[in-house]
């Protein structure tokens, strides 16, 4: 969380941001507020990029001003036009790359005066894990697979039984590149699986955390997944 | 070349499948958003799926349940999945790009036609 | 869902006459995510315009494209025989994700 004051004369405004994470492949938000301003045409809005001349987008007097726009951002960019009344300037990006990652600018004039704040916008993959049970093995194993994650992530497993122990000797993990050469596909196996037990395989680089829950017993198998954004 | 190649239309009677295929030569379908886009015989154009760059798909609510968007990144192929085929999909079907510039590649069209 | 109405319906034109087509959304379009088509009978789309104003690859540049928020424009300086089309504004972003007009028929007077 990054809080921005501008000072112009005797007026100032908030500007808050939130360190944002950007899935590669998707749209992503950086997120930025403001102090809310009724004059709508009287809000300017300025994204900007770290080592880019140009703008990454401007909306003033109610609308878009792409004419400083630079071309790495063009086509791909939107603030969310409705909400800017009420102190909303994030902005929408499409098709997130892992070079859109840096150091972004908001920056805000009302009014009421003016602001700018950081934002640090992190770029990488990440995907819910998916754990099966592996009938095909010698014994009992669990299958833990993520489709894409970047940068590599670490794996480990834990369980509800034997809380604090170490799986690593039991278990075995691999990553395989996709074909889009980026981003790659996480399979961790965990050997010699007990019977009414939950087992967990978190998954976890610097932008994401995932884990995969899966309980087996005679009768059933029940699984939970959740994906968590760091930093943000 | 950029290029985009559909195939697998044809005609089928209601409540029946089909699955279509776009064939893409010159980029690499998993970088890009891809979508089918369809136009009813006399009409406008319609949008019907998007697969995104991360794998994850998205349909018009006309379809939704009943189509299915994917694709074979080793085979650099879109396909569509069509279950439960209506009188109202009757259309040709668009496999397009959007390169963050619009849809900006597009093939030549399938056509589907469902009659009994 | 945001619904582009593109009006006129039908155009009927001379060539060598400037062409002004209309798209209106019925709320606000980021001007990066709005686009332009040409289709020609038995053929697929082409892309005219993106990001509201920019010309796409090979579009020459008596085709050009203006506007923000709810009305855009796609204006065609001098008619040229092959420019007779059906021309289709489309908008990206909102459900469903992509949103095209109806179309406005460009034909010979």
């Known amino acids: 969380l990054i809080i921005g004051f501008g000072i112009s004369g005797k007026h100032f405004i908030t500007v808050t941001t939130f360190t944002s994470a950007g899935n590669i492949g998707e749209d992503g938000t950086l997120s930025c507020t403001f102090e809310p301003d009724i004059k709508l045409n009287g809000i300017v809005i300025q994204w900007l990029k770290e080592g880019i001349k140009g703008l990454v987008h401007e909306f003033k007097e109610g609308k878009d001003d792409l004419s400083q726009q630079h071309e790495m951002f063009r086509g791909r960019t939107a603030v969310f036009a409705d909400q800017v009344v009420v102190g909303n300037a994030s902005l929408r990006l499409k098709n997130v790359q892992l070079t859109d990652a840096g150091t972004y600018t908001c920056y805000i004039r009302t009014s009421k005066g003016k602001g700018n704040a950081n934002l640090e916008y992190k770029t990488g993959a990440f995907s819910m894990p998916e754990i099966n049970v592996d009938y095909n093995a010698s014994s009992e194993s669990l299958r833990c697979e993520a489709p894409r994650w970047f940068p590599q992530p670490t794996v480990a497993w834990a369980s509800q039984v034997d809380q604090g122990a170490n799986f690593s000797e039991v278990s075995n993990t691999s990553f395989e590149l996709n074909s889009e050469n980026v981003t790659m596909k996480v399979v961790s196996v965990l050997y010699n699986v007990t019977i009414n037990n939950t087992y967990s395989c978190m998954i976890e680089n610097d932008i994401a955390k995932a884990t995969g829950d899966i309980k087996v017993t005679d009768s059933e198998v029940k699984r939970r997944s959740q994906l968590q954004l760091l930093n943000s | 070349e950029v290029q985009l190649v559909e195939s697998g239309g044809g005609l089928i009677q209601p409540g029946g499948s089909l699955r279509l295929s776009c064939a893409a030569s010159g980029f690499i379908v998993s970088r890009n958003y891809m979508n089918w886009v369809r136009q009813a015989p006399g009409k406008g154009l319609e949008w019907v799926s998007v697969?995104?760059?991360?794998?994850?798909?998205d349909s018009a609510d006309s379809v939704k349940g009943r189509f299915t968007i994917s694709r074979d990144n080793s085979k650099n192929t879109l396909y569509l999945q069509m279950n439960s085929l209506r009188a109202e999909d009757t259309a040709v079907y668009y496999c397009?790009?959007?390169?963050?510039?619009?849809?900006?590649?597009w093939g030549q069209g399938t056509t589907v036609t469902v009659s009994s | 869902e945001i619904v582009l109405t593109q009006s006129p319906g039908t155009l009927s034109l001379s060539p060598g006459e400037r062409a002004t087509l209309s798209c209106r959304a019925s709320q606000s379009v980021s001007s990066s995510y709005l686009a332009w088509y040409q289709q020609k009978p038995g053929q697929a789309p082409r892309l005219l315009i993106y990001?509201?104003?920019s010309r796409a690859t090979g579009i020459p540049d008596r085709f050009s494209g203006s506007g923000s928020g709810t009305d855009f424009t796609l204006t065609i300086s001098r008619l040229e025989p092959e420019d007779f089309a059906v021309y289709y504004c489309?908008?990206?972003?909102?459900?469903?994700?992509?949103?095209f007009g109806q179309g406005t028929k460009l034909e010979i007077k």
């Open positions: 397009a790009r959007d390169a963050d510039y619009g849809l900006d590649v």
């Open positions: 990001g509201a104003s």
């Open positions: 489309q908008q990206y972003g909102s459900s469903p994700l992509y949103t």
């Open positions: 697969i995104y760059g991360s794998g994850r798909t």
